[in-house]
Interface confidence: low
Amino acid sequence: DSSKWVFEHPETLYAWEGACVWIPCTYRALDGDLESFILFHNPEYNKNTSKFDGTRLYESTKDGKVPSEQKRVQFLGDKNKNCTLSIHPVHLNDSGQLGLRMESKTEKWMERIHLNVSERPFPPHIQLPPEIQESQEVTLTCLLNFSCYGYPIQLQWLLEGVPMRQAAVTSTSLTIKSVFTRSELKFSPQWSHHGKIVTCQLQDADGKFLSNDTVQLNVKHTPKLEIKVTPSDAIVREGDSVTMTCEVSSSNPEYTTVSWLKDGTSLKKQNTFTLNLREVTKDQSGKYCCQVSNDVGPGRSEEVFLQVQYAPEPSTVQILHSPAVEGSQVEFLCMSLANPLPTNYTWYHNGKEMQGRTEEKVHIPKILPWHAGTYSCVAENILGTGQRGPGAELDVQYPPKKVTTVIQNPMPIREGDTVTLSCNYNSSNPSVTRYEWKPHGAWEEPSLGVLKIQNVGWDNTTIACAACNSWCSWASPVALNVQYAPRDVRVRKIKPLSEIHSGNSVSLQCDFSSSHPKEVQFFWEKNGRLLGKESQLNFDSISPEDAGSYSCWVNNSIGQTASKAWTLEVLYAPRRLRVSMSPGDQVMEGKSATLTCESDANPPVSHYTWFDWNNQSLPYHSQKLRLEPVKVQHSGAYWCQGTNSVGKGRSPLSTLTVYYSPETIGRR
């Protein structure tokens, strides 16, 4: 059943004398493996013998033996799928039909393949896209219906006989569907490639020429133009004439329209290849070109820069930046339309020429107030000198200058006065808008720049003011020199360093913290009595009678100040001791008698001792000695001794007389 045999291979294979042919082939014999294979050249079926006649190029038998003459032809297949063949070398007379006679156990099949062998290598075929436009990338394809593993070839691209720089991609196909070698070249043609010859050359492995194909490039492009100008440098003066000519060097397809452009804008009523400009003005300066169009699009010539020369126009000044801050830098720029560019500039400040300034720019690195004013300039080129324009105003801003604090009062100022100060300055830009004062107090500012200090303090030493615009400038502080009475007057003991004892040498000092004016007088007083007029009050030998309340006074031309009262305390041993008796120095026996030890002491007596007429100390230590009941034997002379921290003192003798009572006398 022949329908069981399925073959796949190229229908026709192409080669040339001496090359080789590789025949990719697959088959399927469904009833079993291949048992016999014969390759015929131009086979013909013999009805008589029921067999095929023809040249046997290859034969395989059940025992697998292959005759030696069959080495040129190789069956590279197998018993069930592959039927690939190779003929190497292939000859011209191999052209025709190849017959593959296949036999399995039960089935037979004859498969026919066409072989076309030429005498010489046949040329490849160049394929071009339908239209080629300049600068648009295209792919050129060179196709050769040949490929064989045993015969390597190469395809090379040439432009006007010279190998092309662009890298080509070569691919081969040896499949059951197709056998070919292909080279693809990506290429961006320029207008200059129009009409040029492109060749695809077939070469063997050694680069030897075998065959080729050529095509002529038809590159569509916009018109290519050349512009010519008289005069050739395109530099003229106002009133001269200029001629420009446009020449088309190439156009594909042919051009259709012509126009002229200035600075990118079309010139009306200029549609010929010549542009005539008569009596040119400076406004006609600019970039000129011609534009010619075809179906691809417009083509433009290179630009011609027409320069119409003229003397400088009236100049203007640009200031970077105004207003300027004193100390900053400022740049002035002289702007004047002129062709050629000005070569020299003259600068003016407030109408007066600025010496040594001949450049387009004037740079002042450190602006000062006197730089303010109007700046103007004049530009000059080879055709003449321009006019001075209106100029520009430079405003120089600076902090207030020469700020001073001025005291408006008559001098001297006394503590408690009302003081008025004003803040003055020499100049300021912008104007002064506010003032500041140091130190900061709860003071009155009756008007701008005036400070009123009510009841000025003795310690208001200096005042400084600042005049402020955008900045504050401080004046040097001014001394108020407030005059006041002596302050903080007090009595200070200089000696002795410890407590004062009777008989000590004592010095008291009258101190004060400050006085303005400095010239002062001193006064000492005790209990309203004037004691001295020196700063010190001295006692050579102090006595208890000197104790008391002392004050000192210090006065200057403004006033006088008293110290607080200072108490002088003198310490002394007990003195002026005496014994007093109560109810008297004569007492009846049985009654009560009280003896008191009276004394004068500082500090007071802390300890008393009593003595009798025999100078015997009595066991009593208080100020009072109480005898109750008093006896006649108590009669006699008594004295006492007082002791304090300073020393001791004793009293003279005092006699107590105790007489008998009437009862005692009656008993006797």
């Epitope: 902090p399 140091k438 130190p439 900061h440 400084a464 955008s470 900045w471 504050c472 401080w474």
Partner: nanobody, 125 residues
């Protein structure tokens, strides 16, 4: 001779605090406005904070507002910069500067008359 001496810089962790001081000598401190500037490696000197001579008016850069506080003690001739919630981007050399005009251009380094040598503040992450 006028001298501004900064101190108190050092290494601190992110989120930490630092107080830098600037002691002035050779000038009437109470007449001068004070400013703090900083400069990180490869960057321009930038304004941080300023205070007027009285101590009742202050200005701050947006990047430090709410975190830094400038103050002064005229009796001690000293200006302070208290830096809280420090960030690694606060790392720089901190300079104090004194200016004569108390009311203008507190942000511009060129308007300051005297400068200190700087103190390094490094904030680690």
């Amino acid at each position: 001779e006028v001298q501004l001496v900064e101190s108190g810089g050092g290494l601190v962790q992110g989120g930490g605090s630092l107080r830098v001081s600037c002691v002035a000598s050779g000038l009437s401190f109470s007449l001068y406005g004070m400013g703090w500037f900083r400069q990180a490696p490869g960057k321009e000197r930038e304004f941080v904070a300023a205070i007027n001579w009285r101590g009742d008016s202050t200005s701050y850069a947006d990047s430090v507002k709410g975190r830094f506080t400038i103050s002064r003690e005229n009796a001690k001739n000293t200006a302070y910069l208290q830096m809280n919630s420090l960030k690694p981007e606060d790392t720089a050399v901190y300079y104090c500067a004194a200016r004569k005009y108390s009311a203008a251009n507190v942000f511009k380094p060129n308007d300051y008359d005297y400068w200190g040598q700087g103190t390094q503040v490094t904030v680690s992450s």
